[in-house]
């Protein structure tokens, strides 16, 4: 098993990249002198205890920043948040930490990231630029849930 995170870059089908702004991830068109975040990802070591055929369960973090993506309910609404967390602390836990886990599915070059804690909710960006990443259960409407993930080796 790989027990160090892999690094990657992400953009959506509109060629927007993820950038960190005031502890929030937003999707913006790529420009010069811009520094998109590098993603850190690692597969859950307890894959056998999670649902099969839903994708590869991964923890998603921001490389070198000790920040990880997690899903939590605010009121009745699942929301996407950044939490200060070492991705390896999550990886080493004795059980899957579902609030920080996403099922990563690939179809061709497109990747989706479905919340393990809230099945049917996906990481998404609004079709308008400069908006924070969100969770949505409405696929292919006002929000984009398909991303291009390029691994950095």
């Amino acid at each position: 098993k790989i027990d160090t995170p892999q690094r990657g870059s992400i953009q959506d089908i509109n060629h927007r990249v993820w950038v960190l702004q005031d502890q929030t991830l937003i999707a913006v068109p790529r420009k010069d002198r811009m520094s998109p975040v590098t993603i850190a990802l690692i597969s859950c070591r307890h894959v056998e205890t999670l649902e099969k055929d839903r994708g590869n369960p991964i923890y998603l973090g921001l490389n070198g920043l000790n920040l990880c993506l997690m899903c939590a309910k605010v009121g009745d609404q699942p929301t996407l948040q950044l939490k200060e967390k070492d991705i390896m602390d999550l990886y080493n836990q004795p059980e899957p930490v579902k609030s920080f886990l996403f099922y990563h599915s690939q179809s061709g070059r497109n990747s989706t990231f479905e919340s393990v804690a809230f099945p049917g909710w996906f990481i998404a960006v609004s079709s308008e630029g400069g908006c924070p990443l969100i969770l949505t259960q409405e696929l292919g409407k006002a929000n984009t849930t398909d991303f291009g993930l390029t691994m950095l080796f």
Partner: antibody, heavy 121, light 109 residues
Framework: EVQLQQSGAELVKPGASVRLSCTAS????????IHWVKQRPEQGLEWIGR????????RYDPKFQGKATITTDTSSDTVHLQFSSLTSEDTAVYYC??????????????WGQGTTLTVSS | QAVVTQESALTTSPGEAVTLTCRSS?????????ANWVQEKPDHLFAGLIG???DRAPGVPARFSGSLIGDKAALTITGAQTEDEAIYFC?????????FGGGTKLTVL
Amino acid sequence: EVQLQQSGAELVKPGASVRLSCTASGFNIKDTYIHWVKQRPEQGLEWIGRIDPAIGTTRYDPKFQGKATITTDTSSDTVHLQFSSLTSEDTAVYYCARLHYFGNNFFFDYWGQGTTLTVSS
Amino acid sequence: QAVVTQESALTTSPGEAVTLTCRSSSGAVTTSNYANWVQEKPDHLFAGLIGGTNDRAPGVPARFSGSLIGDKAALTITGAQTEDEAIYFCALWFSNHWVFGGGTKLTVL
């Protein structure tokens, strides 16, 4: 208030099967893992196994694999422990416990009151 | 499979500090064993105290602390109180299963 309420005491004959229950209240059972633990007099605690109630996946101590079966009924927020081919060695108090992630770690934070199982002819 | 060993009984006085330990037959206890400590009071009343070696569960008094001492996990009660009289169990994680110790009966008198 978080609570785990267990079913009442059982007296069963050797060779029979039994199903114990643990009903959760005050929290969403799908957000945690529910474990079963055995306690015999003067013998400490033995971990039996656990279930993820959200998806039904289980883990067992090798010693209890094939002997114990943990299932869940999320519609009633209840987790069951089924034992087959009972012997006097299975006479014990059985506890369900919640393993919950909080802050940075998992905790066996809340426990049921225990169910006494007596296997005797 | 590992055997987890605890002191069978300890006695302390109110206001004193006492340390309970938890040893594994398979070698040194490390943070990767995610030591948990639970308290059992009369009438089968269990409550979690410590998780992840040294994290206190919500609502647990600050006098309870978890640590590693040498090759063992440890629970220290600083300024023991009479209501701390109980049996204390540790649980250690081993890759895919938990193992509980035999428990330490703590008397406070």
